[in-house]
């Protein structure tokens, strides 16, 4: 009997973000997935790790502020991580902060993975082009 | 054909930390890599997935703190995480944070993992200290 | 010789809490371990990588809060986050602030893994009933 | 090849400022840390502070706070540093180095910028 | 902060001998040791990290030891060129730290 199939993707964000669907650099590290459209499609039906880092940089004014980081498969919702930040209503210099949002799934062939966030302009692409990164293994494949 | 090969580490941080460079405890569960001098030294080419947890103790002043916790791979700056905390500029109680980090990387034989906080006095290494981690997995080997 | 054996298990935190020990949803994924009475008892050896992710909710009165997540291995407090949150004093909306923490760890069988929530009250199972997750997989078996 | 190349030498007025600049080529700029090291005249080496290029968070000596303080331009590839409320014991060689191992071991050192203070 | 005594002042030595630069520090540092050569006019340049570990276009007549709180940088035979100050810094303990140095002469 052979070894595990081994699948895996390691992303970082685009530089200029416009959605809050977000849409990921192509010349990540990628094996045994296809990346296309802001989506991982899976090629090996399994059991998928799947974890997600964002840095966020906030500017507060005078109210607090909600980031989210969802993951998403097959476009529905499945996990997300909800941070307020400014809380103190105090207007002040730049707030820096880090979601982050895993998921253990299984997916089929052809089942997609996405990420959404609601204010999207506040993802660092600029300080932090590295840090906003999206990686999904396999870790027990069904066949 | 044999299945994957198997190397892992988790390391807790020192009680008495005195560097920006990390420095972790030898007597952690370390297989198939090496420690030193707050490094991690890989002997098995391969995909590495790398994780580690730090927990921050501040007392805040009249200004906000940044936390910062960095991946270093071969000494070069490879992921991190900035969290602003004592935002709200009130002299107030101790105020505790967790940052974390994770890497999904290919190393090759030699290669080092490190980790750099620029705070690291505020490294909460006494109410904590089990919960200061380095640990790091070979997910797929490439021999 | 055969690949690896395979356990796992993600499950989402039951609807109503009533207790520091979190309980669980018994039908979320699950193989080769099994939930019972809010812990997981593992049916293998070998090392686990465990990982609990919790969505909280605060109404922030004059005073901060910490909330706090504790995994437990067989009742023992293996590994904790402490943040603090409402830092300000301001009496303000909803704070939402969203904590993980992992581990590595060689468990025999019957071992048991549970989670513990000081002010269990704040686990946000409302606004988020599928956003807090208690997730294990076996890295390396030893048979 | 890796450069640091540093602007020229400054002659400053005590309780003067002055800001010296120091561009990095030949490596990715956010990669490491940019370094700042003071020689005063027939004297040994004094580490000042560092500074992550990514984000601009600046460590210091001790001994340098309130003295020193770090910028850097990503776009430019270029780090600085300004000296503040200058005296005569400023008056020093300055280097930026850029480290081997992340850390301290510095492979790679500008060429140096002499600062003299005097009236 | 760590201290760092090199020793001596002045090394004075003919060419083609070998010659050996101490510095020991106030506390144990392992093996977080550097070393550097600054000739004059020049800035220092990298020669040894880690007490012993070498670095690519070093010539390989350079060579450290020691660990703990005891170190050597010894050069297995001298040559005009490598007449310049040696200083050895460690990085063990925040902030980095550097000795006073050694002067080397030819005689």
């Known amino acids: 009997s052979t070894p595990s199939k081994k699948s895996w993707a390691y992303l970082q964000v685009s530089k200029h973000l416009n959605n809050t669907k977000l849409s990921w650099n192509e010349d990540g590290t990628i094996h045994g997935l296809i990346y296309q459209d802001g989506n991982l499609i899976v090629q090996f039906p399994g059991l998928y790790f799947i974890v997600c880092q964002l840095q966020f940089l906030v500017q507060c004014s005078n109210h607090s502020v909600d980031l989210t980081l969802q993951l998403l498969i097959n476009s529905k919702i499945k996990k997300q991580t909800l941070v307020t930040v400014c809380e103190s209503g105090v207007q002040s210099k730049n707030i820096y902060q880090n979601l982050s949002q895993f998921l253990l799934h299984y997916l089929q062939v052809n089942s997609t993975i996405s990420v959404r966030v609601d204010n999207f302009q506040y993802v660092d692409t600029n300080t932090f082009p590295l840090d906003n990164v999206l990686s999904v293994f396999l870790y027990s494949s069904s066949d | 054909s044999t299945p994957s090969k198997k190397s892992w580490a988790y390391l807790q941080v020192s009680k008495h930390l005195n560097n920006t460079k990390l420095s972790w405890n030898e007597d952690g569960t370390i297989h198939g890599l090496i420690y030193q001098d707050g490094n991690l030294i890989v002997q098995f080419p391969g995909l590495y997935f790398i994780v580690c947890q730090l927990q921050f103790l501040v007392q805040c002043s009249n200004h906000s703190v940044d936390l910062t916790l960095q991946l270093l791979i071969n000494s070069k700056i490879k992921k991190q995480t900035l969290v602003t905390v004592c935002e709200s500029g009130v002299q107030s109680k101790n105020i505790y944070q967790n940052l974390s980090q994770f890497l999904l990387h290919y190393l090759q034989v030699n290669s080092t993992i490190s980790v750099r906080v620029d705070n690291f006095q505020y490294v909460d290494t006494n109410t904590f200290p089990l919960d200061n981690v380095l640990s790091v997995f070979l997910y797929s080997s490439s021999d | 010789s055969t690949p690896s054996k395979k356990s796992w298990a993600y499950l989402q935190v039951s609807k109503h809490l009533n207790n520091t020990k979190l309980s669980w949803n018994e039908d979320g994924t699950i193989h080769g371990l099994i939930y019972q009475d809010g812990n997981l008892i593992v049916q293998f050896p070998g090392l686990y990588f465990i990982v609990c992710q919790l969505q909280f909710l605060v109404q922030c009165s004059n005073h901060s809060v910490d909330l706090t997540l504790q995994l437990l291995i067989n009742s023992k407090i293996k590994k904790q986050t402490l943040v603090t949150v409402c830092e300000s004093g301001v009496q303000s909306k909803n704070i939402y602030q969203n904590l993980s923490q992992f581990l590595l760890h060689y468990l025999q069988v019957n071992s048991t893994i549970s989670v513990r929530v000081d002010n269990f009250q704040y686990v946000d199972t409302n606004t988020f009933p599928l956003d807090n997750v208690l997730s294990v997989f076996l890295y390396s078996s030893s048979d | 090849e890796v450069q640091l190349q540093q602007s020229g030498p400054e002659l400053v007025k005590p309780g003067a400022s002055v800001k010296i600049s120091c561009k990095a080529s030949g490596y990715t700029f956010t990669d490491y840390y940019m370094n700042w090291v003071k020689q005063s005249h027939g004297k040994t080496l004094e580490w000042i502070g560092d500074i992550n290029p990514n984000h601009g968070g600046a460590t210091y000596n001790q001994k340098f706070k309130g003295k020193a303080t770090l910028t850097v331009d990503k776009s430019s590839s270029t780090a600085y540093m300004e000296l503040r409320s200058l005296t005569s014991e400023d008056s020093a060689v300055y280097y930026c180095?850029?480290?081997?191992?992340?850390?301290?071991?510095?492979?790679?050192w500008g060429q140096g910028t002499l600062v003299t203070v005097s009236a | 902060d760590i201290l760092l005594t090199q020793s001596p002042a002045i090394l004075s030595v003919s060419p083609g001998e070998r010659v050996s630069f101490s510095c020991r520090a106030s506390q144990s540092i392992g093996t977080s040791i550097h070393w550097y050569q600054q000739r004059t006019n020049g800035s220092p340049r990298l020669l040894i990290k880690?007490?012993?570990e070498s670095i690519s276009g070093i010539p390989s007549r350079f060579s450290g030891s020691g660990s703990g709180t005891d170190f050597t940088l010894s050069i297995n035979s001298v040559e005009s060129e490598d007449i310049a100050d040696y200083y050895c810094?460690?990085?063990?303990?925040?902030?980095?730290?550097f000795g006073g140095g050694t002067k080397l002469e030819i005689k």
């Open positions: 880690y007490g012993s």
């Open positions: 180095a850029s480290p081997y191992d992340g850390y301290y071991g510095f492979a790679y």
């Open positions: 810094q460690q990085s063990n303990s925040w902030p980095t730290t």
